[in-house]
Interface confidence: low
């Protein structure tokens, strides 16, 4: 059959070379002459040549030695073609399997290794691990296992089989009893390394053991008892370095101190910790001491190691009585943040409230008052009462100085001490809101056809708050009602300007009063433009070119010319009577709106 | 006229403080706040900070555990300090008025600067 | 912080030329409140102080001649010199005063050519 079983070579094969591996044949050549070719990495692509076959007899050929730790395996195809070039069977596997042979030692992954270990540590304890690695096949055969061994221990007191190594694992640990640091600090030992699971070749590296101290010595107090002064009211103030001597070694974790409060300290005013150089506790304050309160503390201090102790020691303890020294102390705002309620633009004079301020002091001391931030300059304060009164217009919809209704005042209050103390309190005015703006109308310019005009929607505005807003009312002043209307909407919160009769193209002012639901009334003139134009519109078109429609008949131009001197001198005769002088562009819009009455019957 | 005048030491070693004083005139420092903005040689500004007229302070953050700006109204100084100085700190330092104190003046824009004063840092 | 970013960096005109110069924030600068665009620019010339030209992105400093003109909303912006002088020579910058710490553009230098 066209099968070729997985074919087994050793590495490192002496030859020699070609060396015949497997014979390829195909029961096809009965029929016709076979040529044999094989490809795959190792024949035609790289590593090319590694492999070859005769071309007529079909024997697989190994061509140099092979490197399993290179290349464990290659997957080859064999092909068969008849003379003319056409295959006559499907590509063939040809698996290669390299077997290994003991070409490699053992490497340890570093020259020298660290650990430590407690003195005086049970037999067991585990020190360190050390890892060496062996290139060999470690699956198939013990070229590449390796066994783990001490040669050699320096020194070798109190004897020369302290440690041990496991075969398999490389984990050092401690064999015997009796390890002293203050005797031996530090072991050296040798390892070895073997492959064929400790039958075959060897390396050595070096493993150092340190000899830790442990925790044998309880640290002490020098002295027992301290006495310090403190001011009050200061945090983070350091009140006193306590002093220990360990005899364990310096800066280990059996000699590092840990400080403890143990008593005296029920208000949790002090904390202590230990000073990273001179292993020294320093006693601060965590909170400020209150010389009214109590003017002396005695606190316990016990101290002990960072490390727990190897044997049953006593644990010392610290006194130190903390003397409270009185200073002069801040007046307090009550409460430090007030929220008051104040109408805006109440008159100036108007008292807005009394924010007064305490001294912790027991000396009965004389607090004077001032305005530290007024941002707007609304207010003044009574230095003696803490009376806070109105100077300016508090106006809540001023958004420069007001977020919220609320204007931010910080005041400051003075005590007559040596030397004097400030505190300073926050006062929130909350501004309640009245009636002092009218409704404004959005946009104040508009531009609208004469001719089929669509009405302009307005927004309206009004600073104030509910119930000083909407719904509002709306109504034309100064004669703007004879061509235009203004309508509030249902929701009562836009106005609809309509132009209601004919105007030339030109600009014009519509005055529209706007009222609130207070009845507070704001007049404001809209800019208006009208264009010659049908319908909506937003910039005016070139100049309005009239016309007079068909034929354009002598007649009809007569008529025009009497109708508009009839206007003109109606027009003289109204503007004597009763018109005033700022109706003077409606009028001249009313003649042409007759030439255009006129103008559309002629047609 | 409003003037406002740079004072500073030209040369400092790093790691050690530069105190700048920023001396004004035609103005008084309870109406304007006054910035500091440095500019390192070839390059362009950076805010520093500013102190307004009441003594508060906004800085960069960037620099502002290095920064301090405080202020003597009557003397009508301002001053900066800046500590642990490096190289990279060396540049021409500026003091330079608000337009005004509200926001509504565009305090945010600077009107008048100082000549500005050379700091090299340097060893 | 707000990065102000200017562009181009440097251009060479000839006097009488019209120029523009643009900066853009990476965030908005108008402030809804108000309708105000927190944007300044200033001039520095050779050796001198700078010295503001615009506020609110476009309300000229007093003694500021009207050939300056500041425009733009938002994020971008653009400083117009309609006809260039050769006093105009100096860096440009635009500075934000919208949020802390208050940032300046990179500069745009204007060489004469």
């Known amino acids: 059959d066209w099968v070729v079983a997985p074919i087994s070579v050793p590495e490192n094969g002496k030859g020699p070379f070609p060396q015949r591996l497997n014979q390829l044949k195909s029961n096809k050549d009965r029929d016709t002459k076979i040529f044999y070719s094989i490809t795959g990495p190792g024949a035609d692509s790289p590593p090319e040549g590694v492999f070859a076959v005769e071309k007529e007899t079909g024997w697989l050929l190994l061509n140099k030695p092979l490197d399993r730790e290179e290349i464990a395996k290659y997957e080859l195809f064999g092909h068969a073609v008849s003379e003319n070039g056409a295959s006559v069977e499907d590509p063939m596997n040809i698996s290669i399997i390299v077997t290994d042979q003991n070409d490699h030692k053992p490497k340890f992954t570093q020259d020298t290794f660290r650990g430590s270990v407690l003195e005086g540590v049970l037999p067991g304890t585990s020190v360190m691990q050390v890892t060496a690695t062996d290139e060999d096949d470690a699956i198939y055969t013990y070229n590449g296992v390796v066994a783990y061994s001490i040669h050699s221990q320096e020194p070798k007191d109190p004897h020369d089989l302290m440690f041990t190594i496991h075969r398999s694992t490389g984990t050092i640990s401690v064999i015997s009893s009796g390890l002293d640091r203050e005797k031996v600090p530090e072991y050296t030992l040798t390892i070895q390394a073997t492959d064929m699971d400790g039958d075959g070749s060897t390396t050595t590296a070096v493993a150092v053991v340190e000899i830790l101290d442990a925790n044998d010595n309880a640290p002490m107090f020098e002295p027992q008892k301290y006495e310090a002064w403190v001011p009050e009211n200061e945090v983070g103030h350091e009140v006193q370095r306590l002093t220990v001597t360990d005899l364990d070694v310096p800066n280990s974790p059996a000699w590092r101190a840990t400080y403890h409060i143990v008593g005296g300290d029920d208000g949790d005013h002090f904390t202590i910790t230990t000073h990273p150089e001179t292993n020294q506790g320093v006693l601060t304050t965590k909170k400020g001491l209150d010389f009214e309160a109590q003017d002396q503390h005695t606190l316990y201090v016990e101290v002990t190691n960072e490390a727990p102790f190897a044997v049953k020691l006593p644990t010392a303890t610290a006194t130190v009585v903390v003397h409270v020294k009185d200073v002069n102390e801040a007046p307090v705002f009550v409460p430090p943040s007030k929220v008051v309620e104040v109408q805006e633009g109440i008159p100036t004079g108007e008292p807005v409230c009394v924010y007064t301020a305490e001294d912790p002091d027991k000396e009965n001391q004389k607090i004077s008052y001032r305005i530290l931030r007024d941002p707007a300059g609304w207010l003044a304060m009574d230095p003696d009462s803490g009376q806070v009164t109105a100077v300016g217009t508090l106006d809540r919809e001023d958004e420069q100085f007001v977020r919220n209704n609320i204007y931010e005042v910080m005041v400051l209050a003075m005590d007559n001490g040596s030397p004097p103390t400030t505190g300073t309190g926050t006062l929130l005015l909350t501004l309640i809101d009245v009636n002092d703006h009218g409704p404004v109308p959005e946009p104040r310019q508009i531009t609208i056809c004469n001719q089929s005009p669509v009405r302009q929607v307005l927004n309206i505005t009004d600073k104030d708050l509910s119930p000083h807003t909407s719904p509002f009312q709306a109504q034309l002043t100064d004669d703007s009602d004879i061509y235009w209307t203004a309508e509030v909407n249902e929701e009562g919160d836009t106005v609809v300007l309509s132009l209601k009769k004919f105007l030339k193209q030109d600009t014009y002012d519509v005055h529209l009063s706007l009222s609130d639901h207070g009845n507070k009334e704001q007049l404001t003139v809209i800019r208006a433009t009208v264009c010659d134009c049908h319908g909506h519109v937003e910039t005016c078109p070139g100049p309005w070119k009239g016309g007079s429609g068909g034929g354009g008949s002598g007649a009809g131009v007569i008529a025009v010319i009497v109708v508009v001197v009839i206007a003109i001198v109606a027009g003289i005769v109204v503007l004597v009577i009763s018109r005033k002088k700022r109706m003077a562009k409606y009028e001249k819009a009313e003649i042409k709106e007759m030439g255009e009455m006129h103008r559309e019957l002629n047609a | 006229v409003q003037l406002l005048e740079e004072s500073g030491p030209g040369l400092v070693a790093p790691s050690q403080s530069l105190s700048i004083t920023c001396t004004v005139s035609?103005?008084?420092?309870?109406?304007?706040?006054i910035n500091w903005v440095r500019q390192p040689p070839g390059k362009g500004l950076e805010w520093l900070g500013v102190i307004w007229t009441g003594g508060g302070t906004n800085y960069n953050s960037a620099l502002k555990s290095r920064l301090s700006i405080t202020k003597d109204n009557s003397k009508s100084q301002v001053f900066l300090k800046m500590t642990s100085l490096q190289t990279d700190d060396t540049a021409r330092y500026y003091c330079a008025k608000s337009r005004g104190v509200y926001d509504f003046d565009g305090r945010g824009a600077m009107d008048y600067w100082g000549q500005g004063t050379t700091v090299t840092v340097s060893s | 912080e707000l990065v102000m970013t200017q562009s181009p960096s440097s251009l060479a005109v000839s006097v009488g030329e019209k120029v523009t110069m643009s900066c853009k924030s990476s965030q908005s600068l108008l402030y809804s409140s108000n309708q105000k665009n927190y944007l300044a620019w200033y001039q520095q010339k050779p050796g001198q102080s700078p010295k503001l030209l615009i506020y609110?992105?476009?309300t000229r400093e007093s003694g500021v001649p009207d050939r300056f003109t500041g425009s733009g909303s938002g994020t971008d912006f653009t400083l117009t010199i309609s006809s260039v002088k050769a006093e105009d020579l100096a860096v440009y910058y635009c500075?934000?005063?919208?949020?802390?710490?208050?940032?300046f553009g990179g500069g745009t230098k204007l060489e004469i050519k």
């Open positions: 035609g103005f008084s420092l309870t109406s304007y706040p």
């Open positions: 500075q934000q005063y919208y949020s802390y710490p208050y940032t």
């Open positions: 609110w992105a476009s």
